[in-house]
Interface confidence: low
Amino acid sequence: LQPGAEVPVVWAQEGAPAQLPCSPTIPLQDLSLLRRAGVTWQHQPDSGPPAAAPGHPLAPGPHPAAPSSWGPRPRRYTVLSVGPGGLRSGRLPLQPRVQLDERGRQRGDFSLWLRPARRADAGEYRAAVHLRDRALSCRLRLRLGQASMTASPPGSLRASDWVILNCSFSRPDRPASVHWFRNRGQGRVPVRESPHHHLAESFLFLPQVSPMDSGPWGCILTYRDGFNVSIMYNLTVLG
């Protein structure tokens, strides 16, 4: 990343796994460089942390008593460090939800996984990949959003009632595409425009529901940067 260049933004859904990508591409003269590579991930939490921050599971202790006791810019700390021999270190006990995909490393992928991502994980991340004679870096900003699906009117419906389902994710830009589906057995059946289903951006309008419409409905929001989120809602229609 060039000095002054914009830091790439990665979006993730609160409560879902998040991948913080880091796949530097370099000409390797010797495979041992990659096999013995070490990586260190650091996190600079967003300033003015959200309510969840005092209990930040990744932050170095001791935890402050109240958000106000954090400075305007929480200090950077090491989330995870994996040495050349595969030895790991970080804030102890090492959080099992913070992982490097070991199998991905055969593809030169040093991405950090948060399983799941939490609100307090938002902020700037830096990875340093240490090779024998050089170091490569990745830098990104993690933003977290909340996904929800609401029904209007809410609650149980009766046959012949109408309902509007609204699929949303707390991100400022609009999704590039919205796909609606129903779960049927092991598969997903796409919901298409029809007299029974009217699709408009992130809204699905069912003008006349029946007991057959009971069960899970889902939407997938896909954004221009490739981020997508799947949201489910269980509709109840009484006979």
Epitope: S23, P24, T25, I26, P27, L28, D30, L31, L34, R35, R103, Q106, R107, G108
Partner: antibody, heavy 121, light 107 residues
Amino acid sequence: QVQLVQSGPELKKPGASVKVSCKASGYTFTESPMNWVRQAPGQGFEWMGIIYTDTGEPTYAEEFKGRFVFSLDTSVSTAYLQISSLKAEDTAVYFCVSDYGSILYWYFDVWGQGTLVTVSS
Amino acid sequence: DIQMTQSPSSLSASVGDRVTITCKASQDVSTAVAWYQQKPGKSPKLLIYSASYRYTGVPSRFSGSGSGTDFTFTISSLQPEDFATYYCQQHYNAPPTFGQGTKLEIK
């Protein structure tokens, strides 16, 4: 030393199937992906795709989607290429190629000796 | 896909000659170009990768240069064992693509 040994030449009739094997030795099989590359008679090379030996996940080049299947038997460190519904234009030498020393990039340093597949009626 | 155009397609030279082969990429591939040597009935051997890095064990008479779209492969002083077909390949992204080859023959 690191090497890939492929199965012998095959003569097949159009419409038949063939399975080419590629046995790896000298390194940990699941630590390097396996590529397949085709060289038609008197022609250059075409990259057919890759199979990640840790997950078994294949990726095929566009023109090799459909009749071509990559598979693995990690217990014997062997990768396989199966071609079904053979056509005369499938006649070529097929190479398995490990990017053993080049995992971050798409260049190839360990090649099998090649398997000639001839399709003729 | 990125196209690699190699020239010349064939070349006659004598032992001791300096030989140069060129390769042009259809788009910028930075320095991600490899060169291979193939002898009849054999598998290719990697000589050069990342435009100018010699692979392990490759003699110093083989060299490569270039960046962006234009690349050059040079044999500084031909030896009898160098008569073969040479291929360039871009390793900038998938799918990796090869040039059509340059057959180097004895004059």
